[in-house]
């Protein structure tokens, strides 16, 4: 197991996931640290516990290695880092990676008012509704602005989204959240459609998919609950 | 589905041996990372021994030098040979896998298993 020491002065690795970071209860998912082609060891820490280990084979000069969750859970849901030793020195810890789980208990209900189809500039709010009282809602706009809300509520939320744009437009779900790392099973999509202005076209995005695989987001939120832009599908954290 | 059975277990001196088995069950077992945990009376499950699914292994440093996990890929049977036995040995120990898994990882905490045995009691008394 790795042993801080003052001479921990290898740069650190860089730590994602794919398929997502956010993963369907009982999925697998690939996390990746990639360190130097020099590293012997490479460790995986889960919530600052030692999770698992990778010794690269010396005939395999890679730079990274992959660690496969094959099923998880509410109990492989949360922050991960990665180390890796190059002789006798170890890198500093990567960037946090936040892994989510979702499909846990039950569905949401999302709707949005005064109506799914509105005029540009006309203000819109978002309704997020779980039986199961939560903690935490998440707004999420699928290939959209890379934004994600959220609010504090105890079985609703309301998202207000002030006058609409057309970059608002899109199809919008949202989860309820048990822990900032256990979510609900996804809502329903809800797809805002936006009419008027110089160029008038209600077109929602042409991409006929509603999948999650297709969303992009960061789950490091800022105190406004608005997040930062990160891709989704090759979720990498790196300074 | 993947079953593990657990045997070996008994009672045995302090400065003793013994050998633990884990018998799979089903065809995945080559792909499989395998470990051993232990849970003392009273106390929390810990980590003992991992085997990787390329015989790459790892311990916990209160068993280094004393225990040897191996596997046999023909029988399906995963080892934990113990020697120097302790009193503070004794304890529930678990066989688990993950199943399946990638290249050689080898896999340190409980949370990581999807599959578990039931235990086979190992007392070290004199």
């Known amino acids: 197991q790795r042993i801080n020491t003052e001479k921990e002065t290898l740069p650190k690795p860089i730590i994602w996931a794919k398929p997502s970071i956010m993963v369907t209860n009982g999925n697998s998912v690939n996390i990746w640290c990639q360190g130097a082609q020099s590293a012997s060891e490479y460790q995986l820490y889960f919530e600052g516990s030692f999770f698992a280990l990778e010794r690269p084979k010396p005939s395999r000069s890679m730079n990274k290695v992959r660690f496969f969750i094959s099923q998880m859970t509410s109990h492989t849901a949360g922050i991960y880092t990665c180390f890796y030793q190059s002789g006798e020195l170890w890198s500093k810890s990567s960037n946090p990676l936040k892994l989510v789980v979702t499909g846990l208990y039950d569905t949401p209900n999302l709707w949005v008012y005064p109506r799914p189809e509105v005029t540009l500039g006309e203000n819109v709010t978002f309704f997020c509704q779980l039986k199961t009282a939560t903690s935490k809602f998440f707004l999420l706009k699928e290939r959209g602005s890379n934004h994600i809300q959220n609010k504090y509520g105890n079985i609703q939320a309301e998202f207000p989204m002030g006058p609409v744009t057309r970059a608002h437009r899109g199809t919008y779900r949202c989860f309820g959240s048990y822990n900032d790392y256990a979510w609900s099973f996804p809502s329903e999509p809800v797809t805002l459609l936006i009419t008027g202005g110089v160029e008038n076209s209600s077109l929602a995005p042409t991409d006929p998919t509603s999948s999650l695989d297709y969303w992009e987001f960061d789950l490091s939120t800022n105190e406004s609950g608005l997040q930062k832009d990160s891709a989704f599908w090759d979720h990498t954290t790196q300074n | 589905e993947v079953q593990l059975v657990e045997s070996g277990g008994g009672e045995v001196q302090p400065g003793g041996s013994l050998r633990l088995s884990c018998a799979a069950s089903?065809?995945?077992?080559?792909?499989?990372?395998m470990g051993w945990f232990r849970q003392a009376p009273g106390k929390e499950r810990e980590f003992v021994a991992a085997?990787?699914?390329?015989?790459?292994?790892y311990y916990a440093d209160s068993v280094k030098g004393r225990f040897t996990i191996s596997r046999d890929n023909a029988k399906n049977t995963v080892y934990l040979q113990m020697s120097s036995l302790r009193a503070e040995d004794t304890a529930v120990y678990y066989c688990?896998?993950?199943?399946?898994?990638?290249?050689?990882?080898?896999?340190?905490?409980?949370?990581?298993?999807?599959?578990w045995g039931q235990g086979t009691l190992v007392t070290v008394k004199p």
């Open positions: 089903g065809r995945t077992f080559a792909s499989a990372a």
């Open positions: 688990a896998a993950v199943v399946p898994t990638y290249g050689n990882n080898i896999y340190v905490h409980s949370a990581a298993y999807n599959y």
């Open positions: 085997i990787s699914r390329s015989d790459d292994t």
